[in-house]
């Protein structure tokens, strides 16, 4: 059945890299240039993709690959194989529909992408506020109230960098 | 096959204006919302102006009240008029298409321009 197929089917002795030309009686031709084939047997050569304006080219397209993109200083890859480039924001802010806008109060993101988290809300453990949250940092928990023993000296925060706030209750 | 094409640039003094064009072709420009960026050799590219197909706009916070983007879509064109030039607007400036109507957000499927220079000097 292999050797029927095969004599059926002379596309399928064609390498990646190369296509089945029907246009010259079925022999394998090489992919043009900017077009690739990945796999044995292919008809037609896939275009290969372009890493233009805020992507960059990571990886050039060979007869037998794709090229792969990655994104300019400034910018991060969202979605599979680099798909998106989205603009990169400071710490304490985060990418909205009119571009990056500081964290609201009671929220911070400490990476220059994703979004605005809400502060922990250390009562929820039983817990107490040792530091306090920015823009940029997550509160951070100390011992309850309960924890700390009569006449036992508190740790005193360090003075914040910047807005402080509270965990909201 | 798509093509985007930006002319206009050139030699302008501070507080100098210029009109950018971006002449489009290849695909349904009137449904399509496009975008203009820039590129400072060194640093990287930003977003400058983004318009969608009816015509609604967004600035960066850099070039709002100096720059306008608009569209004709009867001749398949988007602009950019730059007015009160400073320095720090000299730049290659591109036009692309803008399919994830995102701010600062651009897929792989968009489409970009060569680029125009435009250089701002006393």
């Known amino acids: 059945f292999e050797r029927t197929r095969s004599l059926q089917d002379p596309c399928s002795n064609c390498p990646a890299g190369t296509f089945c030309d029907n246009n010259r009686n079925q022999i394998c031709s090489p992919c043009p240039p900017n077009s690739f084939s990945s796999a044995g047997g292919q008809r037609t050569c896939d275009i290969c993709r372009q890493c233009k304006g805020v992507f960059r080219t990571r990886k050039e397209c060979s007869s037998t690959s794709n090229a792969e993109c990655d994104c300019t200083p400034g910018f991060h890859c969202l979605g599979a194989g680099c798909s998106m480039c989205e603009q990169d924001c400071k710490q304490g802010q985060e990418l909205t529909k009119k571009g990056c806008k500081d964290c609201c109060f009671g929220t911070f993101n400490d990476q220059k992408r994703g979004i605005c988290r809400p502060w922990t809300n250390c009562s929820l453990d039983g817990k107490s506020v040792l530091v306090n949250g920015t823009k940029e940092r997550d509160v951070v928990c100390g011992p309850s109230p309960a924890d700390l023993s009569p006449g036992a000296s508190s740790v005193t925060p360090p003075a914040p960098a910047r807005e402080p706030g509270h965990s909201p209750q | 096959e798509v093509q985007l094409v930006e002319s206009g640039g050139g030699l302008v003094q501070p507080g100098g204006s210029l009109r950018l064009s971006c002449a489009a072709s290849g695909f349904t420009f009137s449904s399509s919302a496009m975008s203009w960026a820039r590129q400072v050799p060194g640093k990287g590219f930003e977003w400058v102006a983004y318009?969608?197909?009816?015509?609604?706009?967004y600035y960066a916070d850099s070039v709002k009240g100096r720059f306008t983007i608009s569209r004709d879509n009867a001749k398949d064109t988007v602009y950019l008029h730059m007015n009160s030039l400073k320095f720090e607007d000299m730049a290659v400036y591109y036009c692309?298409?803008?399919?994830?109507?995102?701010?600062?957000?651009?897929?792989?499927?968009?489409?970009w321009g060569q680029g125009t220079q435009v250089t701002v000097s006393s």
């Open positions: 692309a298409t803008w399919r994830s109507q995102q701010v600062g957000r651009w897929d792989e499927y968009d489409h």
């Open positions: 318009i969608y197909s009816d015509g609604s706009t």
